[in-house]
Amino acid sequence: STTKCTVSHEVADCSHLKLTQVPDDLPTNITVLNLTHNQLRRLPAANFTRYSQLTSLDVGFNTISKLEPELCQKLPMLKVLNLQHNELSQLSDKTFAFCTNLTELHLMSNSIQKIKNNPFVKQKNLITLDLSHNGLSSTKLGTQVQLENLQELLLSNNKIQALKSEELDIFANSSLKKLELSSNQIKEFSPGCFHAIGRLFGLFLNNVQLGPSLTEKLCLELANT
């Protein structure tokens, strides 16, 4: 192999190698590929054709600004996709449309300021969605009920100012257990905001300046679930 990746037990570690493109000489039977801390700007779908057995792909800490929807067409078994610390700013309906088997999607520390339309609507198996450390101003992730198997929604360190029932009720059929909202500037809990997610096990609000009246409002809304 010309690439200095380490391969062991179907796991390829290609991290910290200053790679500018996906290696094309790794064993075709790898199931885990770590490409973190490189200089990747794109993930051409064609480059993953030979790695169709991947169940986990970690491309964190690169400079990826756009994803080709065809990527997941080449990776039909992919369960974990980690894109943390990249330069993604927009997600479209097509971005993850073929990533139907994902159980974990990590998008923390990108530049996503708004979720438009329904980019996660095909993720029927998703358990963990991490959108922390972005620029999101609301919890709106879609326009229809979806993400029926989601258990963890991580939204800490964003710019969320209000929790609204019309944004959170897309989770009406989901089994959301953990909602992480720490380090946001929450100033409002609108009536019925927790109605659709009443089975929450943990609501995390560390470093959120609640104050007495907002705390009372929060308790009232939680009591009404």
Partner: antibody, heavy 122, light 107 residues
């Protein structure tokens, strides 16, 4: 097989309210897998989207900017239908009005009503 | 996706291939649907989600979408395909944006 049956007057006077109803069979207006809306087509013109309603834990609507101040779309769950109300009509609102079912997840219209020609004239 | 632009008319000889374009800024990032409308009738969905064909729609209808242009292709065009064709997409909060429509004439 889903069917949409429209009803309502074909003639409305200027400044009055246009009211149409769309009765649904083969599906539920409260479905979690579809949305419902209205489109119109002025004589010799293209299709113009007017608005949509969809149910999550509550009902939500979205209206076209061009009619936003005048339009209301309401569900009637007891009769499994939905309605269109367009206030303060003018002759420019003369058109064939269609009700429609939008299929999730990407809002293609897979079923249309038969269309109702509404003329606005005194 | 606020504006979708279609050619007003397209002509094709019977048996030939007709292509109807629908252009819009970065339309390739959105799903496009195509509707066929014959005079005096309600529209009919012929292609959804760029390239999917509803049951009952002939195989000669196909679609593609990338960059700034979506295309409806009718291979081996038949006289019965003469109609108006509309492209459509959605972009919250405008749940439907239609193109201006293209009149397909089968010569």
């Amino acid at each position: 097989q889903v069917q949409l049956q429209q009803s309502g007057p074909g003639l409305v006077k200027p400044s009055q309210t246009l009211s149409l109803t769309c009765a649904i069979s083969g599906d539920s207006v409260s479905s979690n897998s579809a949305a419902w809306g209205w489109i119109r087509q002025s004589p010799g013109r293209g299709l113009e989207w007017l608005g949509i309603i969809q149910k999550r834990s509550k009902w939500y609507n979205n209206y076209a900017v061009s009619v936003k101040s005048r339009i209301t779309i309401n569900p009637d769950t007891s009769k499994n239908q939905f309605s269109l109300q367009l206030n303060s009509v003018t002759p420019e609102d003369t058109a064939v009005y269609y009700c429609a079912r939008y299929s999730y997840p990407f809002y293609s219209i897979d079923y249309w009503g038969q269309g109702t020609l509404v003329t606005v004239s005194s | 996706q606020s504006v979708l632009t279609q050619p007003p008319s397209v002509s094709v000889a019977p048996g030939q291939t007709a292509r109807i374009s629908c252009s819009g800024d970065n339309i390739g990032s959105y799903y496009v649907h195509w509707y066929q409308q014959k005079p005096g009738q309600a529209p009919v969905l012929v292609i959804y989600e760029d390239s999917e064909r509803p049951s009952g729609i002939p195989e000669r209808f196909s679609g593609s979408n990338s960059g700034n242009t979506a295309t409806l292709t009718i291979s081996g065009t038949q006289a019965e395909d003469e109609a108006d064709y509309y492209c459509s997409s959605y972009d919250d909060p405008n749940f439907q944006v239609f193109g201006g429509g293209t009149k397909l004439t089968v010569l």
